[in-house]
Structure formats: structure tokens, C-alpha cells
């Protein structure tokens, strides 16, 4: 569960479970910064607009990121 306040890192938990790209509204990658020393990936779901934090170290999540970027590059002219 991510938190909206910018108090250091954003996420409460990080999941290794990939989400279905079709159920994704938005995928944000927040780079490490002075506020949070680690990369955080926040998936906004189409259903209820809920946000989920994904583990950037997980193989499944890395595959998801590849799939999403591939899909985006197909769509862009």
C-alpha cells in the first residue's frame, strides 16, 4: 500500500507478484533520491484506482516492466 505523503519512501509493502498489464491504469517508477534511497515502482490499478507497490528486485516485476515498455513502444508512432 503506498502512502500519498512524501515522507521518505512511499510504500508500506512491496510485492513480488506481477500485476496483469491489462488491469493497469498507470505504472510509476520513482528513482532513488535523498528522500528514499531505493527505487519504488507504484502500479495504479484500473479497478478503484488503487495503488500497489512492486518490488523492483523481483524477476517477475522486471519482466512486467519489459512487457509494459514493449507495449508502449508498439503504440507510439
Amino acid at each position: 500500500v503506498p502512502l500519498s505523503r512524501t515522507v521518505r519512501c512511499t510504500c508500506i509493502s512491496i510485492s513480488n507478484q506481477p500485476v496483469n498489464p491489462r488491469s493497469l491504469e498507470k505504472l510509476e517508477i520513482i528513482p532513488a533520491s535523498q528522500f528514499c534511497p531505493r527505487v519504488e515502482i507504484i502500479a495504479t490499478m484500473k479497478k478503484k484506482g488503487e495503488k500497489r507497490c512492486l518490488n523492483p528486485e523481483s524477476k517477475a516485476i522486471k519482466n512486467l516492466l519489459k512487457a509494459v515498455s514493449k507495449e508502449r513502444s508498439k503504440r507510439s508512432p
Epitope: 500500500v1 502512502l3 500519498s4 505523503r5 515522507v7 521518505r8 519512501c9 510504500c11 508500506i12 509493502s13 512491496i14 510485492s15 513480488n16 528514499c36 531505493r38 478503484k48 488503487e50 500497489r52 507497490c53 518490488n55
Partner: antibody, heavy 117, light 109 residues
């Protein structure tokens, strides 16, 4: 399998302090937020506090804000709850629970805290 | 802060269908989670994200959520289902908190 074992409960005098601990095993502790929830005798569940996976964010229920402090040690897979200025109404069974992105998917068996006046 | 209202008790005979409600303002916009707590035991998650079941939870347990009411349905109720049931949501409106309903005691006659 996931295991959460609370300890540190007991009898404490009103106004005094007590420190609860929760030993976690069977999952990657450092990936998950952790919660404390309590249940007064014969009553319902009351959420108390959560700490994020890396310890950088902590949130509390109004009933314990300023009196209780949640902390964690990821190197030892341990969650703590430091309770101070205890009141009679803090008498309850205290559970630690694992966050699952909204729901709490695993719970310990609880540790009983009795505050005597 | 979100407030969740549950009926204190529900009683029915074995084999019947139990319906336990959880009321809250626009609760349909949030994900609702349900826990079963048997006497002397810790709570167990039985339904999460309105309708999903954790592994090991029988298909007899199902959930729905729309408008101002979320519902936990237990079909073909058994004596072993007798327990307290709690609904819960994550509330991020003012400050982040995890809110429980008051609980419903399910009695199997």
C-alpha cells in the same frame, strides 16, 4: 510457512511502560509492512499502528498516538511496540500482523497485556 | 474517518446461507477485506479485495461490495463456521489507518 510470535505481554501498572516484540519467519520480512492490532476482552479488533517495510513510515491510531511507538529490526526479523503511559483501557490481547497491500494476511496468536490501577 | 457498521449477530441453521453486511459511506469505492475469528484464536483472512479468497479458504465463502454495503456470504453453513466475522478497509482520507467493523457473531443453530 509464515509464523508470527508475539512476546512481552504481562501485568503493568497504570502509567508505566511495556515493550512487546514479534518474531517473524517464513517470508521476506524486509519486503512487508507490519501492524499491531489489539482486542480488549470480549470486544472487537482495533488497529493500532503500521510500519513500512523499510521502517521509514509509521502511522498510528488516535487512541495510541504519542504513547506507543512501533519499530522494526529487519536484520533480526523483529517487530516491536513500545507502550508508555499505560491506561486501564489498554488491557487487551495484542496481535502483530503482516501487511498484504490492504488486508492483513497473517496474524500471530497474540500476547496479553493487563494494566492494573 | 471511515466507520464500518456490522450487525452484532446472525443466527441460522446448518445448510442455510449466511449473509453478513458491512455498511459504510461509499464503501463500494474501497476494497473490503473479511476475517473469521473463532473463540480463543487469532483472526484469519477469508476474503480480500471485495471478492478474492486466499488459498485454503473454501469456495463457500464469497464477497461482494457496491454502494454503501459490502457483504460476506457463506453458503451451506456448517457448525465449524460459527465465529466472529470482521470487515476491514484501508482508509487514506485524512491520515492512513486500517479500520475494522465492530464484528458479527455468527451462530449456527
Amino acid at each position: 510457512q509464515v509464523q508470527l510470535v508475539e512476546s512481552g505481554g504481562g501485568v503493568a501498572q497504570s502509567g508505566k511502560s511495556l515493550r512487546l516484540s514479534c518474531a517473524a519467519s517464513g517470508f521476506t520480512f524486509s519486503n512487508y509492512g507490519m501492524h499491531w492490532v489489539r482486542q480488549a476482552p470480549g470486544k472487537g479488533l482495533e488497529w493500532l499502528a503500521v510500519i513500512s517495510y523499510d521502517g521509514s513510515n509509521r502511522y498510528y491510531a488516535d487512541s495510541v498516538k504519542g504513547r506507543f511507538t512501533i519499530s522494526r529490526d529487519n536484520s533480526n526479523n523483529t517487530l516491536n511496540l513500545q507502550m508508555s503511559s499505560l491506561r486501564a483501557e489498554d488491557t487487551a490481547l495484542y496481535y502483530c500482523a503482516k501487511d498484504a497491500g490492504g488486508p492483513l494476511d497473517y496474524w500471530g496468536k497474540g500476547t496479553l497485556v493487563t494494566v492494573s490501577s | 474517518l471511515t466507520q464500518l457498521t456490522q450487525p452484532p449477530s446472525v443466527s441460522l441453521a446448518p445448510g442455510q446461507t449466511a449473509t453478513i453486511t458491512c455498511g459504510g459511506d461509499n464503501i463500494g469505492r474501497k476494497s473490503v477485506h473479511w476475517y473469521q475469528q473463532k473463540p480463543g484464536q487469532a483472526p484469519v483472512l477469508v476474503v480480500y479485495d471485495d471478492t478474492d479468497r486466499p488459498s485454503g479458504i473454501p469456495e463457500r465463502f464469497s464477497g461482494s461490495n457496491s454502494g454503501n454495503t459490502a457483504t460476506l456470504t457463506i453458503s451451506r453453513v456448517e457448525a465449524g463456521d460459527e465465529a466472529d466475522y470482521y470487515c476491514q478497509v484501508w482508509d487514506s482520507s485524512i491520515d492512513h489507518s486500517w479500520v475494522f467493523g465492530g464484528g458479527t457473531k455468527l451462530t449456527v443453530l
